[in-house]
């Protein structure tokens, strides 16, 4: 339904608090380098303008699109060119090209300082002094570092952030109360950001059809009792929500997400028996809860799939009449029967089915041609099953840190041109699949592991896209969304790689390593491991293990020494010499 003033419509729907928060998120995701107070000022100006439009929808400029209003506001920033360079050229464009231009300049790895957590007392004082500004700063800092963070979900995180400070700043032991909650929010936030980044990549790089296929498979697993028409309606609405958020239309996205949650709860009887608790919660919690809800039980006595999709003589007729609808029904029927499969596997099966029908429906005897199509699925199903079994065994044998190291070596040998920080970050995250998924029973392992790996490999893809250095990464990232993981798994050692020159500075360590947290210390060691492999890509596992064991002993010894810095200098030289000898450098 058309509104005279879009900005007034969204202000009224969302309320002032959510409106301001979402505009702040939008602005911080576009202009990631601007200081906090500049954004606050711009948001306040937009909010005041929105209020005039609520009072009189016919007032000047109230009929303008949100992109026009927001874009005009962003283009008033005086230092646009000196801070953002060519992004300033966006302001010479008209909508919708201007917004597309801003979107293209979003930076997945902005050059921003690491967020350092102040002392608990300092945070509590700041929270009590100015709660509203404290929470705005949280939204701003997360949004600018995660320019595709799912905005309505970030409001949910902010609500939990506020609740943590409200509770813990009154506690006897503030730190014991607050720090675990902040750690949990940080870890969940990173995971949420990465999951949303994959959704946006899916929409932006592979199109709406790819996203809809993903959504059909996932929602059919989650809501196996729902009819195909119901799932299709949910998929259409969900696609609209994510298209809006990924496109920077955060007010529309949040509004439509609230409408979708309302619809789901009003129709839960025909969707899922697992929604009752979610639907009793307030809006932000409700939407989050629905997004994370467990799979409903499969209906009893579902007929064999073969009847409709292989044995029926109408397969080609039904396919020809409405290809995407028929393939959607196949995906729905297969997914609701297989909560034990990853979404990407289900999509590979659907693609195989589609390719077979394309070929066979043009053949002399279509039925004869596609009669054995389900046999083609067997190796596709077994490949991830075997891979997960092998890797979970390795994880259980090694533990998380050493499992990460094994993956670091594996991926550095596959794509040694990728920057060391990216290889460390991605391999560490790949390694987390062990503790995240291997504890699950067989029936839950594959959806947990392979769909998580899709999220992590997408991080590699978006970081690599910013500074492409490897044709192999580009190939795996761009050829097929659902085959990214098999593509990376299939990569062998890059024989064309010319080993990096040895640089002793890379392997020089100082006493500051002793004061680092265990995680930071691991990252230092893993960085050194990647550099070792880049110097000596043909090094064996045994050689690398020996060097890493020596390195760990060296750090431990020098951190216990009285004169730590001297120890690091002297013992470090010996270690480098011994490592070079061991690896034949």
């Amino acid at each position: 339904d058309a509104h005279k003033s879009e900005v007034a419509h969204r202000f009224k729907d969302l309320g002032e608090e959510n409106f301001k928060a979402l505009v702040l998120i939008a602005f911080a995701q576009y202009l990631q380098q601007c200081p906090f107070e500049d954004h606050v000022k711009l948001v306040n100006e937009v909010t005041e303008f929105a209020k005039t439009c609520v009072a009189d929808e016919s007032a000047e400029n109230c009929d303008k699109s949100l992109h026009t209003l927001f874009g005009d506001k962003l283009c008033t920033v005086a230092t646009l060119r000196e801070t953002y360079g060519e992004m300033a050229d966006c302001c010479a464009k008209q909508e919708p090209e201007r917004n597309e231009c801003f979107l293209q300049h979003k930076d997945d790895n902005p050059n921003l300082p690491r967020l350092v957590r102040p002392e608990v007392d300092v945070m509590c004082t700041a929270f009590h002094d100015n709660e509203e500004t404290f929470l705005k700063k949280y939204l701003y800092e997360i949004a600018r570092r995660h320019p595709y963070f799912y905005a309505p979900e970030l409001l949910f995180f902010a609500k939990r952030y506020k609740a943590a400070f409200t509770e813990c700043c009154q506690a006897a032991d503030k730190a014991a109360c607050l720090l675990p909650k902040l750690d949990e929010l940080r870890d969940e936030g990173k995971a949420s950001s990465a999951k949303q980044r994959l959704k946006c990549a899916s929409l932006q790089k592979f199109g709406e059809r790819a996203f809809k296929a993903w959504a059909v498979a996932r929602l059919s697993q989650r809501f196996p009792k729902a009819e195909f028409a119901e799932v299709s309606k949910l998929v259409t609405d969900l696609t609209k929500v994510h298209t809006e958020c990924c496109h920077g239309d955060l007010l529309e996205c949040a509004d439509d997400r609230a409408d979708l949650a309302k619809y789901i709860c009003e129709n839960q009887d025909s969707i899922s028996s697992k929604l009752k608790e979610c639907c009793e919660k307030p809006l932000l919690e409700k939407s989050h809860c629905i997004a994370e809800v467990e799979n409903d039980e499969m209906p009893a006595d579902l007929p064999s799939l073969a009847a409709d999709f292989v044995e029926s003589k109408d397969v080609c007729k039904n396919y020809a009449e409405a290809k995407d609808v028929f393939l959607g029904m196949f995906l729905y029927e297969y997914a609701r029967r297989h909560p034990d499969y990853s979404v990407v596997l289900l999509l590979r099966l659907a693609k195989t089915y589609e390719t077979t029908l394309e070929k066979c429906c043009a053949a002399a005897d279509p039925h004869e041609c596609y009669a054995k199509v389900f046999d083609e699925f067997k190796p596709l199903v077994e490949e991830p099953q075997n891979l997960i079994k092998q890797n979970c065994e390795l994880f259980e044998q090694l533990g998380e840190y050493k499992f990460q190291n094994a993956l670091l070596v594996r991926y550095t040998k596959k794509v040694p041109q990728v920057s060391t920080p990216t290889l460390v970050e991605v391999s560490r995250n790949l390694g987390k699949v062990g503790s995240k998924c291997c504890k699950h029973p067989e029936a839950k392992r594959m959806p947990c592991a392979e769909d998580y790996l899709s999220v992590v490999l997408n991080q590699l893809c978006v970081l690599h896209e910013k500074t492409p250095v490897s044709d192999r990464v580009t190939k795996c990232c761009t050829e097929s969304l659902v085959n990214r993981r098999p593509c990376f798994s299939a990569l062998e050692v890059d024989e064309t790689y010319v080993p990096k020159e040895f640089n002793a500075e890379t392997f020089t360590f100082h006493a500051d390593i002793c004061t680092l947290s265990e995680k930071e210390r691991q990252i230092k060691k893993q960085t050194a491991l990647v550099e070792l492999v880049k110097h000596k890509p043909k090094a064996t596992k045994e050689q690398l293990k020996a060097v890493m064991d020596d390195f760990a002993a060296f750090v431990e010894k020098c951190c216990k020494a009285d004169d730590k810095e001297t120890c690091f200098a002297e013992e470090g030289k010996k270690l480098v010499a011994a490592s070079q000898a061991a690896l034949g450098l």
């Epitope: 200081p35 107070e37 005086a78 100015n130």
Partner: nanobody
Framework: EVQLVESGGGLVQPGGSLRLSCVAA????????IGWFRQAPGKEREGVSC???????YYADSVKGRFTISRDMAKKMVYLQMNSLKPEDTAVYYC?????????????????WGQGTQVTVSS
């Protein structure tokens, strides 16, 4: 409540130096830019220098190379070191909290003001 108090003004000879201080009470410098403004007799108030919450600095052309803005987050202090002072720098200097918006300061971008401190450059 946001409160700003300036100090450090006085009488100085041309070519001399002064260091103005601004203490910020009731808020944290993490959330605001602090700007220094001045108003000479019979003239409009003008932006002199500005420092953002993340430490970026801006200066009016007339003071570039002579004035330096800095801050001490722990003490909630912002300083304006003024060197090579000229008679035309004579004015009441105010500090204010708000947003630099990428410049040395526009009054409209600042919501909270101090009372001001007099700087006189004369031989």
């Amino acid at each position: 409540e946001v409160q700003l108090v300036e100090s450090g003004g006085g009488l100085v000879q041309p070519g001399g130096s002064l260091r103005l201080s601004c203490v910020a009470a009731g808020f944290t410098l993490d959330y605001y830019a602090i700007g220094w403004f001045r108003q000479a007799p019979g003239k409009e108030r003008e932006g002199v220098s500005c420092i953002t919450s993340d430490g970026r600095t801006y200066y009016a052309d007339s003071v570039k190379g002579r004035f330096t803005i800095s801050r001490d987050m722990a003490k909630k202090m912002v300083y304006l070191q003024m060197n090579s002072l000229k008679p035309e720098d004579t004015a009441v200097y105010y500090c204010a909290a708000g947003a630099c918006m990428g410049g040395s300061g526009y009054e409209a971008d600042f919501g909270s003001w101090g009372q001001g401190t007099q700087v006189t450059v004369s031989s």
